[in-house]
């Protein structure tokens, strides 16, 4: 049985009744707000295995583990999500663990975890297993594990019997429970699913099945559902739904959600029935359930009630999907986000004309603005204080406004503000000054020339490498010494390193917006002898690694024709030499007869070079009969200090301070300080956190039904 | 996948209040769709009685207006008819039935009410 | 309220034949939107009405090619190009484009 279009369970816990017979819901479930601590234990719902949108829990008493409840839950769509997320477990007071011990997909969206104060099992599960990406994965102030003493099933009686996977570079067992296994499937069996017996399902199967190799047997399917068969398309005369079943036209045609209420009823477009003509279609004629192209872009004017917009995730970009004319003010502040360009530009690339003002602030998951790919007028009807009409402040990691040479943008009233954009050179500023018509406008402190481009690569002459010699923890490298019009201006120069496996580095990488510079950095003072060619020893490196290496001309600040110059260079990849390995991983014995031990082991993590043989040594060894005394495994003898309150722990957000063995007669040295980024990241981070309370709250309180 | 089950007394008396209920599983009433009462009385044709929408709003056959409430509770997913002071000429089987953007596509499988003392 | 009157009550067939059935609205039946919310329905002796056309002429995925409608405006038609024994039952139009929503009185279909 289909349930949907979403199930809200609240305040009493036998709502939980209406879960019965589903096998799929169509929808999101929500169980939230459960205050009075009940017994789950009789509620079991075998039936269901897949939510097409997401799952959200928060603030349910007494519930200790999703298991019991959704024993066969499969597989998370993903197909909407909850601000990003496609599971959220959200202050659940009581959860032991999660429990899912079926849950083999999340087909989009992450994961986030968060103010479970019991909650343990969660270092055990290998998510990547489960989700494409686990970078946006947000695990934090749950019980911090070491207070957990989780153990996979059958660690303590030394008969492992749960697979490893590496997470973080620690080997480990992955499981659900103290008696539940995370399954994996056979590596033979690819990026298909497998059964409870490990034979490999049909190609067109996600999560699992019941029969190997049978697409009528699946327990989800990887594209469409369609009269009991997994189908990689919908078959003629049937159209895609909600992102996973093939329905006919009939259906579609009678659709009346509480969400297309207002719209003259679904479409069926590319093969799909949806609530709306997709962009660059428009319906053709008032009732037709069909779409035509529309001459140029479709025109859709969008209001917010508000007056300003809030972009701070793709589930508030979503709500401008196919809109041209927004009629009020944008405020941007995207701070992370999985594949965020191209979900944002998905749902706002179609705006071509704002009629206040648009604001990006605090937006660090953003490199460039070209999502808002049609933006062509921006009105400035409504302006900010000061008479802003485009306001760009503390954006870390904003190189690129858009491409100006394939862009025509007007700002027809109002100024613009630049501030606090480090990676944001001032010549894109000025490029934009010319192109929106606004040069003249801008006061001398609205383009903040000192921390616009701070960090950006606005340079214009090239400096060149001379040398370079390598070993194997070591790079020297020199260049040319770079001769500005005034030499007074050169001050010193910048090395720009980091390690970098493949030759596509660019200078701005790992600043894909959500991180801070990728890049080591180290100042170079430049040589008394003018005829001495500046250079420098890049120490503490790794054996046999490829780096990529840059160097920038540290000059002050020279205005030429409104650009200011420098000098750098294009990135060099250079590979320290061989080194001794590190010590082999995983080392196991066991014997087989009497006279034969069977060693096994797991390359070193560090291989330092190219590996050509191991050499193994042995020697007999006295037997402690002392190790047989106690039993260090025992799962009560692991001490539980303290009950964790579901704040978030600080231990888990940073790092420890690590106490250093100085050289000399020093001793230990003290920790050190937080740096400003540091302290501004944790700022951020608890922002992040306040934003996405406030949307779960926005979102599941309502007012009481009449 | 859709289903709806009607359920209430078979036998209402003159002048009472004739109370059924249509439990709805497979889908949330407040999701979308019209959620109808039809009847039948028997030997004869289908009469519509009204109908509460997703949001809760209610329409109902003017000559049975003064009389007819169909309300819902949300968390048991289920709605209801009420119809006060009835007379032999309510006697018919009632269905509860649902309606989309164009036509009913699920259909209870109806109870019969008989007014009798 | 608009009334909703079918024409002929009873209808004997043969199966094989064709036969047609009639239903007149007292008004126009076409929405503000331009659609017309008519459907015919048939119901088979002891169970609930099951869907067969809607908006006049779109026949439900799954039902017989033989069963086709038309009409416009306060005039439509069923039509059953030739009749089978599974096709007895009463056949109901509805309008649905205007509240309070009305059915017809009911053909009954019958084999001669």
């Known amino acids: 049985e289909i349930c949907g279009p979403g199930i809200d369970i609240r305040n009493d816990y036998q709502q939980l009744k209406r879960l019965e017979n589903c096998t799929v819901i169509e929808g999101y479930l929500h169980i939230l707000l459960i205050s009075k601590a009940e017994d789950y234990r009789s509620y079991r719902f075998p039936k269901l295995t897949v939510i097409t949108e997401y799952l959200l829990l928060f603030r349910v008493a007494g519930l200790e583990s999703l298991g019991d409840l959704f024993p066969n839950l499969t597989v998370i769509r993903g197909w909407k999500l909850f601000y990003n997320y496609a599971l959220v477990i959200f202050e659940m007071t009581n959860l032991k663990d999660i429990g899912l011990y079926n849950l083999r997909n999340i087909t989009r969206g992450a994961i986030r975890i968060e103010k479970n104060a019991d909650l343990c099992y969660l270092s055990t599960v290998d998510w990547s297993l489960i989700l494409d990406a686990v970078s946006n994965n947000y695990i934090v102030g749950n019980k911090p594990p070491k207070e957990c003493g989780d153990l996979c099933p059958g660690t303590m009686e030394e008969k492992p019997m749960c697979e490893k996977t590496t997470i973080n570079n620690e080997y480990n067992y992955r499981c659900w429970t103290t008696n539940r296994c995370q399954k994996m499937c056979p590596s033979t069996c690819g990026k298909r699913a497998c059964t409870e017996n490990n034979e490999c399902c049909h190609p067109e199967c996600l999560g699992s099945c019941s029969a190997p190799d049978n697409d009528t047997a699946c327990v989800a399917c990887r594209h469409y559902y369609y009269a009991g068969v997994c189908v990689p398309a919908c078959p003629p005369n049937t159209y895609r739904f909600e992102g996973w079943r093939c329905v006919d036209r009939d259906f579609c045609a009678n659709i009346l959600s509480a969400e297309s209420s207002d719209s003259e009823g679904f479409v069926i477009h590319d093969g799909e029935c949806m609530q709306e003509c997709p962009s660059g279609f428009i319906r053709n004629g008032s009732q037709s359930m069909y779409c035509i192209p529309c001459e140029g872009p479709c025109p859709k004017v969008c209001e917010e009630e508000k007056k300003t917009k809030t972009i701070d995730s793709v589930t508030s970009a979503q709500m401008l999907q196919g809109c041209t004319i927004f009629k009020g003010n944008l405020l941007i502040n995207i701070r992370r986000g999985n594949n965020i360009a191209s979900e944002l530009e998905n749902f706002m690339g179609l705006i071509e004309v704002v009629t206040g003002y648009v604001k990006i602030r605090h937006s660090h998951a953003l490199v460039s603005l070209s999502f808002l790919k049609n933006l062509r007028l921006i009105l400035g009807e409504e302006q900010l204080e000061g008479n802003y009409s485009f306001y760009v402040l503390d954006n870390q990691n904003l190189q690129q406004l858009w491409d100006w040479d394939h862009r025509n943008l007007t700002i027809k009233a109002g100024k613009m503000y630049f501030a606090f954009n480090p990676k944001l050179c001032v010549s894109e500023i000025y490029r934009m000054e010319e192109v929106t018509g606004t040069k003249g406008r801008q006061s001398k402190g609205d383009i903040n020339t000192r921390n616009n481009g701070e960090r950006a690569s606005c340079e214009s002459d090239v400096l060149h490498f001379t040398s370079t010699t390598t070993s194997k923890n070591r790079i020297i490298i020199t260049w040319h010494r770079y001769r500005p019009p005034d030499y007074r201006d050169l001050i010193s120069f910048t090395v720009y390193y980091k390690e970098a496996p493949f030759k596509n580095v660019t200078e701005y990488d790992g600043q894909d917006a959500c991180g801070s510079n990728s890049w080591n950095m180290v100042d170079v003072d430049l040589p008394p002898n003018k005829d001495v060619e500046p250079g420098i020893l890049l120490h503490g490196l790794k054996p046999w690694t490829q780096y990529a290496v840059y160097v920038k001309a540290v000059t002050l600040t020279m205005v030429e024709n409104d650009h200011i110059r420098g000098a750098k260079s294009e990135i060099l990849y250079i590979r320290t030499n061989a080194s001794v390995p590190s010590i082999p991983l995983d080392v196991l014995s066991a014997s087989n007869s009497s006279s034969q031990l069977i060693v096994k082991w797991n390359p070193p993590s560090l291989p330092n070079g190219n590996l050509s043989y191991y050499i193994v040594r042995w020697q007999r060894q006295p037997q402690d009969g002392y190790l047989y005394r106690h039993n260090y495994c025992s799962k009560d003898k692991i001490p539980i200090r303290k009950y964790a309150d579901g704040t978030i722990d600080i231990e888990e957000v940073t790092e420890n301070p690590k106490t250093e063995v100085c050289g000399g007669e020093k001793g230990p040295c003290c920790a050190c300080p937080k740096t400003e980024a540091e302290k501004q990241a944790e700022k951020e981070e608890a922002e992040y956190r306040k934003v996405f309370e406030n949307f779960l709250h926005n979102s599941i309180f309502v007012p009481r039904p009449e | 996948q859709v289903q709806l089950q009607e359920s209430g007394p078979g036998l209402v008396k003159p002048s009472e209040t004739l109370s059924l209920t249509c439990t709805v599983s497979?889908?949330?009433?407040?999701?979308?769709?019209?959620w109808n009462w039809i009847r039948q009385p028997p030997g004869k044709g289908l009469e519509w009685i009204g109908y509460i929408s997703y949001d809760g709003t209610n329409n109902y056959k003017p000559s049975l207006k003064d009389r007819v409430t169909i309300s819902r509770d949300t968390s048991k997913n289920q709605f209801s008819l009420k119809l006060s002071s009835v007379t032999a000429a309510d006697t018919a089987v009632y269905y509860c039935?649902?309606?989309?953007?164009?036509?009913?596509?699920?259909w209870g499988q109806g109870t019969l009410v008989t007014v009798s003392s | 309220d608009i009334v909703m009157t079918q024409s002929p009550l009873s209808l004997p067939v043969t199966p094989g034949e064709p036969a047609s059935i009639s239903c007149r609205s007292s008004q126009s039946i076409v929405h503000s939107n331009g659609n017309t919310y008519l459907q015919w329905y048939l119901q088979k002796p002891g169970q609930s009405p099951q869907l067969l056309i809607y908006?006049?002429?779109n026949r439900l995925y799954g039902v017989p090619d033989r069963f086709s409608g038309s009409g416009s405006g306060t005039d439509f038609t069923l039509k059953i190009s030739r009749v089978e024994a599974e096709d007895v039952g009463v056949y109901y139009c509805f309008q649905g484009s205007h509240v309070p929503h009305t059915f017809g009185q009911g053909t009954k279909v019958e084999i001669k």
């Open positions: 497979g889908y949330s009433i407040t999701g979308g769709y019209l």
């Open positions: 039935a649902r309606y989309g953007r164009v036509f009913f596509d699920y």
């Open positions: 908006k006049v002429s």
